[in-house]
Amino acid sequence: KFSKQSWGLENEALIVRCPRQGKSSYIVDWYYSQTNKSIPTQERNRVFASGQLLKFLPAEVADSGIYTCIVRSPTFNRTGYANVTIYKKQPDCNVPDYLMYSTVSGSEKNSKIYCPTIDLYNWTAPLEWFKNCQALQGSRYKAHKSFLVIDNVMTDDAGDYTCKFIHNENGANYSVTATRSFTVKDEQGFSRFPVIRAPAHNETKEVEIGENTNLTCSACFGKGAQFLATVQWQLNGNKITDFSEPRIQQEEGQNQSFSNGLACVNTVLRIADVKEEDLLLRYDCLALNLHGLRRHTIRLSRKNPIDHQSTYC
């Protein structure tokens, strides 16, 4: 049940996370399942355990097998299994199916290809990207953080994409490669200047002091997948993250597809325990895409005490 397949190439680094969820700082013991022999934690070993991670620096074909991890506490032991397979490097350019990570699909408006498993490694930009073993060159390809963006995607951009990066461990460098297929969807979509559906511009919302309230910022950006479409709240012209008031939190944006196919995104601003000073703030709903930025402002006002209706959204 708590088992996960992991694979890598000989002479490359491979890092595997314990498939059993724990929390950081808990003791995690790793064992070779077949022999029940404990895996060392000393970093001088080629294969060593480091908390929730098992590191092969570098991996060898003989490392293939099942590894047991146990997240330990005096009252809970959580056991997981990592099924590791290390393959010989292919002499030719062909990447066999068993080395492929999940396929991703893109379109003219949305062509991000994430480098699989990279978050487990200590790497520094830039990533190198290859398609069918050829290094990607030209202004259409942009390596951005842990993903590749392709401008003006066409059907012949479909294929196998390999990311290559260097993992650094205590000053030693190890190569890592990962490959996944990219397919192109033919999508008749379009992008347009953002339209904010809520709130109305210069809207005022009545709230009760001491109660909780939610403000929803919702905007539509066109039809089909959008390359860039974000909504966010600002307080008095500042980002929420720059505004050190833990009572006021912004939820992550959520994509919404409507029956008419519009690509819309919303984000909720949650205000706990509304205070008088919150009524003095300007709340800006910002919608941004490649066409530009639109802003709607909403303010809070104290609810008339005679009106006893609930103010929850």
Partner: antibody, heavy 117, light 111 residues
Framework: DVQLQQSGPGLVKPSQSLSLTCTVT?????????WNWIRQFPGNKLEWMGY???????TYNPSLKSRFSITRDTSKNQFFLQLNSVTTEDTATYYC??????????WGQGTSVTVSS | DIVLTQSPASLAVSLGQRATISCRAS??????????MHWYQQKPGQPPKLLIY???NLESGVPARFSGSGSGTDFTLNINPMEEEDAATYYC?????????FGSGTKLEIK
């Protein structure tokens, strides 16, 4: 995100049984974690009552002897508290909570239960 | 059962100042270099909320002004600087053995 929603009666007569339900959304109770019941007496003292883990195995606080049990309905993603032969001493706010490992990470909203004739 | 004794029972601290809450266990809750003590915050009408696990690890989303320390039988929760929304009751809980037990709580108010 894991969310726990509690339901059950607010008033129970002495010597009767108390039954409460905790409905979990955002996570399957058979995937992992332990699913606890905790109560808070008037005066705010908290007492851990026990848990049922993802596999259905239970662990109880010995202070509740054999009066207490936790069961589950995996098809509805719910787990239940049953406390038999209640007395006025069982008047409390009852919480369900989930445990990733050791600590109580997510809590239900609480159900206030009064034992009175 | 391991008994957890919190002190003080109540505490008033000025905004911007440090609040310190203690929790003493009747026997050690540490083993293998880890301390199995956790801290919660509870506001009226709400369930407790996890702040710190394993004595000193900040739960995700909890502000950095909260910190925990200690090992063996003596543990401390610090809030620095005290903010208005920190007025609440704070509880310690151990998971060294069954049954888990909680401290009696410390009510923190604004001076």
């Amino acid at each position: 995100d894991v969310q726990l929603q509690q339901s059950g009666p607010g008033l129970v007569k002495p010597s009767q049984s108390l039954s409460l339900t905790c409905t979990v959304t955002g996570y399957s109770i058979t995937s992992d974690y332990a699913w606890n019941w905790i109560r808070q007496f008037p005066g705010n003292k908290l007492e851990w009552m026990g848990y049922i883990d993802y596999s259905g195995s239970t662990t109880y606080n010995p202070s509740l002897k054999s009066r207490f049990s936790i069961t589950r309905d995996t098809s509805k993603n719910q787990f239940f508290l049953q406390l038999n032969s209640v007395t006025t001493e069982d008047t409390a706010t009852y919480y369900c909570a989930s445990t990733v490992i050791d600590s109580m990470d997510y809590w239900g909203q609480g159900t206030s239960v009064t034992v009175s004739s | 059962d391991i008994v957890l004794t919190q002190s003080p029972a109540s505490l008033a601290v000025s905004l911007g100042q440090r609040a310190t809450i203690s929790c003493r266990a009747s026997k050690s809750v540490s083993t293998s270099g880890h301390s199995y003590m956790h801290w919660y915050q509870q506001k009226p009408g709400q369930p407790p909320k996890l702040l710190i696990y394993l004595a000193s690890n900040l739960e995700s989303g909890v502000p950095a002004r909260f910190s925990g320390s200690g090992s063996g039988t003596d543990f401390t929760l610090n809030i620095n600087p005290m903010e208005e929304e920190d007025a609440a009751t704070y509880y310690c809980q151990h998971s060294r053995e069954f049954p888990f037990t909680f401290g009696s709580g410390t009510k923190l108010e604004i001076k």
